[in-house]
């Protein structure tokens, strides 16, 4: 039997710079029944609160609600490993929220097969951003990858389209159905999920309507 | 306890590419980006780019876009910075260094000198 | 890119006494946010760099309460109030509101 071991906070998530999760690893717990907790100060701040909510996001993690995120505040975070033999802590994390942005997918993804002049085919894709974003006002600048790929195949092809929400593919085999999916990144965080697939079928006559 | 170490010194000719690796411990190597940052003789601070380890998604200073390419092995937790087209201003000590979820640098290696010389 | 201009560029300061160090950048650094990324890292001798302080005027884990910052918009201040042996190196600024990052040229300090 032993003190615990120490934490370490691996991962905090943002879905929309209004709320976050942090979520740590316990770290051993020297065969003795372990309480965990998480505490925090802000910048120029001397205060130390405790985790408002262990609860929401799951085990060994602190959801910080709208009332308790702020983006113009760093948070200091630790977390704390009690059993009867003693306690440990983890490095101090500090956390921007403009930095743990993860959002939702994009939304809409709409195919649809089009023909230039010359006849030739191309898959025009579009798509809006997540729900919660509010792009318009420059508050979030996001980037967007799709990908695609005949149903069969095992590799994507991927394109990045930078801020733009529509891309045209060409040279697509006539005849297959192709799957495409599409995410987005803001400034300064992480790409969410990729969206859930989307299936188009190219037509192997080419008389179509522009 | 968070540690950065970095491969050793490299002698180079003018032309050729170098890679600095730097091994990542004491913390969950795909949850942090990783920088890359250099300082000629003497002289100040360059930032050559950032990777996330989670995604290899990469920036990079638009002066070294290019030259510069920045991978990891999460296996290893090793990051690594190849600059290629080396040329004698290259000569500078390159670190690596992780920041928390914010935008500065709160944990470097100990830095690799790269010298580039015919 | 932001260009970071340090002064002066060397420092002599007696124990006990203090000192200041100017940073002025070519750009506004406030962020979309509404926050000033501005920091101030110290490289002691032999040494890879450490950060003092983090958005302007906080002091990071660790660093004694004697190493200051202020300043807004373009003008930046470091202040140390009593200079102690073990201040001495090179201290750099640096901003990373603006991609790509960018640092001052150094202001090396040294005890008289």
């Known amino acids: 039997q032993s003190p615990p071991g120490k934490p370490e906070i691996h991962k905090c998530r943002s879905p929309d710079k209004e709320t976050f999760t942090c979520w740590w690893n316990p770290g051993t717990d020297g065969g003795l029944p372990t309480n965990y907790s998480l505490t925090y100060s802000k910048e120029g701040e001397k205060t130390t609160y405790e985790c408002p909510d262990y609860k929401t996001s799951g085990p060994n993690s602190c959801f910080f609600s709208k009332q308790y995120t702020s983006i113009w505040k760093i948070y200091i975070i630790t977390v704390n490993a009690t059993n009867q033999m003693g306690s440990s802590s983890s490095d101090p994390l500090y956390v921007d929220v403009t930095y743990i942005v993860e959002p939702e997918p994009p939304r809409n993804l709409t195919l649809e097969v089009k023909q230039l002049k010359d006849k030739k085919t191309y898959l025009w894709v579009k798509w809006s951003p997540p729900t919660i974003t509010d792009v318009k006002t420059g508050w979030f600048t996001m980037e967007y990858e799709i990908r695609l790929k005949p149903e069969e195949a095992e590799e994507w092809e991927i394109h990045f389209t930078g801020h733009q929400t529509q891309f045209k593919v060409f040279d697509l085999y006539p005849g297959q159905k192709y799957l495409v999916q599409t995410r987005c990144k803001p400034d300064h965080g992480y790409w969410s999920r990729w969206s859930q697939e989307s299936s188009v079928e190219m037509p192997n006559d080419f008389t179509l309507k522009d | 306890e968070v540690q950065l170490v970095q491969s050793g010194a490299e002698v180079k000719k003018p032309g050729s590419s170098v890679k600095v690796s730097c091994k990542a411990s004491g913390y969950t190597f795909t949850s942090f980006w990783m920088h890359w940052v250099r300082q000629a003789p003497g002289q100040g601070l360059e930032w050559i780019g950032v990777i996330d380890p989670s995604d290899t998604y990469t920036n990079y200073n638009q002066k070294f876009k290019g030259r510069a390419t920045l991978t990891v092995d999460e296996s290893s937790s090793t990051a690594y910075m190849e600059l290629s087209s080396l040329r004698s201003e290259d000569t500078a000590v390159y670190y690596c260094?992780?920041?928390?979820?914010?935008?500065?640098?709160?944990?470097w290696g100990q830095g690799t000198l790269v010298t580039v010389s015919s | 890119d932001v260009v970071m201009t340090q002064t002066p560029l060397s420092l002599s300061v007696t124990p006990g006494q203090p000192a200041s160090i100017s940073c002025r950048s070519s750009q506004r650094l406030v962020h979309s946010n509404g926050n000033t990324y501005l920091h101030w890292y110290l490289q002691k001798p032999g040494q890879s760099p450490q950060l003092l302080i983090y958005k302007v005027s906080n002091r990071f884990s660790g660093v004694p309460d004697r190493f200051s910052g202020s300043g807004s918009g373009t003008d930046f201040t470091l202040k140390i109030s009593r200079v102690e042996a073990e201040d001495v190196g090179v201290y750099f600024c640096?901003?990373?509101?603006?991609?790509?990052?960018?640092f001052g040229g150094g202001t090396k300090v040294e005890i008289k």
């Open positions: 640096s901003q990373s509101t603006h991609v790509p990052w960018t």
């Open positions: 260094a992780r920041g928390d979820y914010s935008n500065w640098f709160t944990y």
